[in-house]
């Protein structure tokens, strides 16, 4: 029972995590214009992995996709790749784990087969979560580097009469969604791996043995005794918090930008 609960919870947690990774990948707010210590502008810039947007104070939002592949920074391409790999692995993991669930009977599938599938999906979830966390962290690192570079530019080279508003970018909502989602997928994967141990019982069947008592022809046959050892069945209650992310896509598509570097 505990094994089923652990496996089921692992599946649900991973499902939420992968949904979060997909949401984060699609979100436009990976980086948002830094408003602190900047002139108050009547426009707000934010960028995603696939397009960048500008929201005007008047209410109009315009987004433009990055229609170039070669012109984009290698780091951005790497983040895209990591997120997509994470989604693909997670999706395959979910598919495998559905068939591995103890509560679902498919034909005459052996427990050992289910255990192997549970382990496989668990590993896939772990790798998927790590991919998402890595992708988001690489992007965050890129933002931090660019932030300090643009901050340095703000305080140097101001000898000219004309000032230019230096748009600096900071962490967007998608980064936090990605981190939380990656973490959930990772936890779900670990839970699946733990559940796998409980699904692979070591079976010892004691065959019937005849004891001949002297003078009597009475055979003593104890019933077939099955000893199963359950590992890792003491799953603790975990409260999972899903960072409620809101994607805002009120786009009335008009134009935008590609300046990550």
């Amino acid at each position: 029972m505990a094994v089923t609960a652990c496996q089921g919870l692992g599946f649900v947690v991973s499902l939420i995590g992968i949904a979060g990774i997909i949401a984060a990948t699609c979100m436009d707010q990976w980086s948002t214009q830094d408003l602190y210590n900047n002139p108050v502008t009547a426009v707000f810039n934010y960028q995603g992995l696939w397009r960048s947007c500008v929201r005007e104070s008047s209410g109009f939002t315009e987004c433009r996709g990055y229609f170039t592949l070669l012109g984009l920074p290698a780091m951005l391409q790497a983040v895209r790749a990591l997120m997509i790999v994470g989604i693909v692995l997670g999706a395959i993991g979910l598919l495998v784990s559905i068939f591995a669930l103890k509560c679902i009977r498919i034909g005459s599938m052996e427990d050992s087969a289910k255990a192997n599938m549970t382990l496989t999906s668990g590993i896939m979830f772990i790798v998927s979560g790590l991919c998402a966390i890595a992708g988001v962290s690489v992007f965050a690192n890129m933002l931090v580097t660019n932030f300090w570079m643009s901050t340095a530019n703000m305080y140097t080279g101001m000898g000219g009469m004309v000032q230019t508003v230096q748009t600096r970018y900071t962490f967007g909502a998608a980064l936090f969604v990605g981190w939380v989602a990656g973490g959930l997928t990772l936890i779900g994967g670990v839970m699946m791996c733990i559940a796998c141990r409980g699904l692979a019982p070591e079976e010892t069947n004691y065959k019937a043995v005849s004891y001949h008592a002297s003078g009597h022809s009475v055979a003593y046959k104890p019933g077939g005794f099955k000893a199963s050892t359950g590992f890792g069945s003491n799953t603790k209650n975990k409260k999972i918090y899903d960072g409620g992310a809101r994607t805002e896509d009120e786009v009335q598509s008009y134009p935008s930008k590609h300046d990550y570097v």
Partner: antibody, heavy 117, light 113 residues
Framework: QVQMKESGPGLVAPSQSLSITCTVS????????VTWVRQPPGKGLEWLGV???????NYHSALTSRLRISKDKSKSQVFLKLSSLQTDDTATYYC???????????WGQGTSVTVSS | DIVMTQSPSSLTVTAGEKVTMRCKSS????????????LTWYQQKPGQPPKLLVY???TRESGVPDRFTGSGSGTDFTLTVSSVQAEDLAVYYC?????????FGAGTKLELK
């Protein structure tokens, strides 16, 4: 179709407060903002402030302490309140709707306000 | 605050003539996010409210005759009237629509010879 109409007192005594109402139709105040602009007689345009669809406001730095802009979405009305009036506050006051590029695409006809004792 | 400087303050022209007025801002009005310049041009005739002509420095508002052309980027902008008509006689204002407060220029008055 978008329409905007300002209504004000016409004459206000110095040191008093000025209250002007802008009644709009053809668009929602929850979605779009309303900007206030004034024009002293024979002079240029002066941007006063704006209230955006989400209720946030921005004011001209020189008027921050004296100016308040608010709205009543249910009545489709925007209010301008300018306190401690001086004679140089005499102007035609316009309300306008910001559109694409934050440009003011619709304007009211304006209401003339004279600050005099 | 951003200072918007318009030149010349007045222009006397003959009908059919090409006219150019300038607007200079003390800070760049170019938004890196969409590579658009948040500068707007208005036309105001006597006794009337201003009328929007051009936004984003070069995008003509619908219904505005194509003889009006906005151009420029960063801090220097121009409004060109290719062939001045009698109905174009008015005061033309530029406005910063990028950094608060959204200041106006002092205006350029277009007069007929």
């Amino acid at each position: 179709q978008v329409q905007m109409k300002e209504s004000g007192p016409g004459l206000v005594a110095p040191s008093q407060s000025l209250s002007i109402t802008c009644t709009v139709s053809g668009f929602s105040l929850t979605t779009y903002g309303v900007t206030w602009v004034r024009q002293p007689p024979g002079k240029g345009l002066e941007w006063l402030g704006v209230i955006w669809g989400d209720g946030s406001t921005n004011y001209h730095s020189a008027l921050t302490s004296r100016l308040r802009i608010s709205k009543d979405k249910s009545k489709s009305q925007v209010f301008l309140k300018l306190s401690s009036l001086q004679t140089d506050d005499t102007a035609t006051y316009y309300c306008a709707k910001p559109g694409r590029g934050n440009a003011l695409d619709y304007w009211g006809q304006g209401t003339s306000v004279t600050v005099s004792s | 605050d951003i200072v918007m400087t318009q030149s010349p303050s007045s222009l006397t022209v003959t009908a059919g003539e090409k006219v150019t007025m300038r607007c200079k801002s003390s800070q760049s009005l170019l938004n890196s996010g969409n590579q658009k310049n948040y500068l707007t041009w208005y036309q105001q005739k006597p006794g009337q409210p201003p009328k929007l002509l051009v936004y984003w420095a070069s995008t003509r508002e619908s219904g505005v005759p194509d003889r009006f052309t906005g151009s420029g980027s960063g801090t220097d902008f121009t409004l060109t009237v290719s062939s001045v008509q009698a109905e174009d006689l008015a005061v033309y204002y530029c406005q910063n629509d990028y950094i608060f407060p959204l200041t106006f220029g002092a205006g350029t008055k277009l007069e007929l010879k």
